[in-house]
Interface confidence: low
């Protein structure tokens, strides 16, 4: 049965060419995490595998930076970045979970973290 | 490789208050979240709370509004401050980290709810 919760940073905001860190966190299980997958949209940006460490997927590699822990940082962001974003999380022996966090790159220099909260 | 020692567990009547502390040594703040878990007797280990080095913070449902967790990075040290403590709260609590992105587990400490 799988007990576990996805919790994210949930909405946020940047400006153009900043950076941000997207971040999840697995909760409410002992499940044992073996991969740690990113995407955007139909995407892979990267993979963070338990024994064999991560990967960035070469289209993203100057941009892309892993972590912190689980999480992935996002540079020289244009505002083709906006969108969503989801962290895959395969366990055993629960399974895959899912969390979702949507990405705004302004323009502007107002830019601001919105609300931090649990995607359902 | 990542050490952990929890410490602040004991005996307390219901209603009461404790604070558990987990000193980690190696690098453990690189970025990675710290937290706790619990088991009480007889029953599976369950997740009670987690701290981001940023300061986020998430607590299971049974703790909310009595609980805080919280750390120092100085120190690579995480607290677990309990109040309106219930003899269902009784357990053996552990830390955890994942700093490098995968679990270590401290030795635990015991607390005990009880009039």
């Known amino acids: 049965m799988m007990t576990g919760t996805i919790e994210t940073t949930g909405n946020i905001s940047a400006e153009k060419g900043g950076s941000i860190i997207l971040q999840c966190h697995l909760s409410s299980t002992t499940a044992q995490v073996t991969q740690v997958n990113w995407e955007q949209q139909d995407q892979l940006l990267a993979i963070c595998n338990a024994d064999l460490g991560w990967h960035i997927s070469p289209s993203f590699k100057d941009r892309v930076a892993p972590g912190p822990g689980l999480g992935l940082t996002l540079q020289s962001l244009t505002v083709n970045d906006t969108g969503e974003y989801f962290c895959i999380y395969h366990t055993y022996p629960d399974g895959t979970y899912t969390g979702r966090i949507f990405l705004e790159v302004l323009e502007s220099s107002v830019a601001e973290h919105g609300a931090r909260f649990q995607i359902p | 490789e990542v050490q952990l020692v929890e410490s602040g567990g004991g005996l307390v009547q219901p209603g009461g208050s404790l604070r558990l502390s987990c000193a980690a040594s190696?690098?453990?703040?690189?970025?990675?979240?710290m937290g706790w878990f619990r088991q009480a007797p007889g029953k599976e280990r369950e997740w009670v709370a987690s701290?981001?080095?940023?300061?986020?913070?998430w607590y299971a449902d049974s703790v909310k509004g009595r609980f805080t967790i919280s750390a120092d990075n100085s120190k690579n040290t995480a607290y677990l401050q309990m109040n309106s403590l219930k003899p269902e709260d009784t357990a053996v609590y552990y830390c955890?980290?994942?700093?490098?992105?995968?679990?270590?587990w401290g030795q635990g400490t015991l607390v005990t709810v009880s009039s």
């Open positions: 190696g690098n453990t703040f690189s970025g990675g979240f």
């Open positions: 701290v981001l080095r940023g300061g986020y913070t």
């Open positions: 955890t980290t994942e700093g490098s992105g995968w679990r270590n």
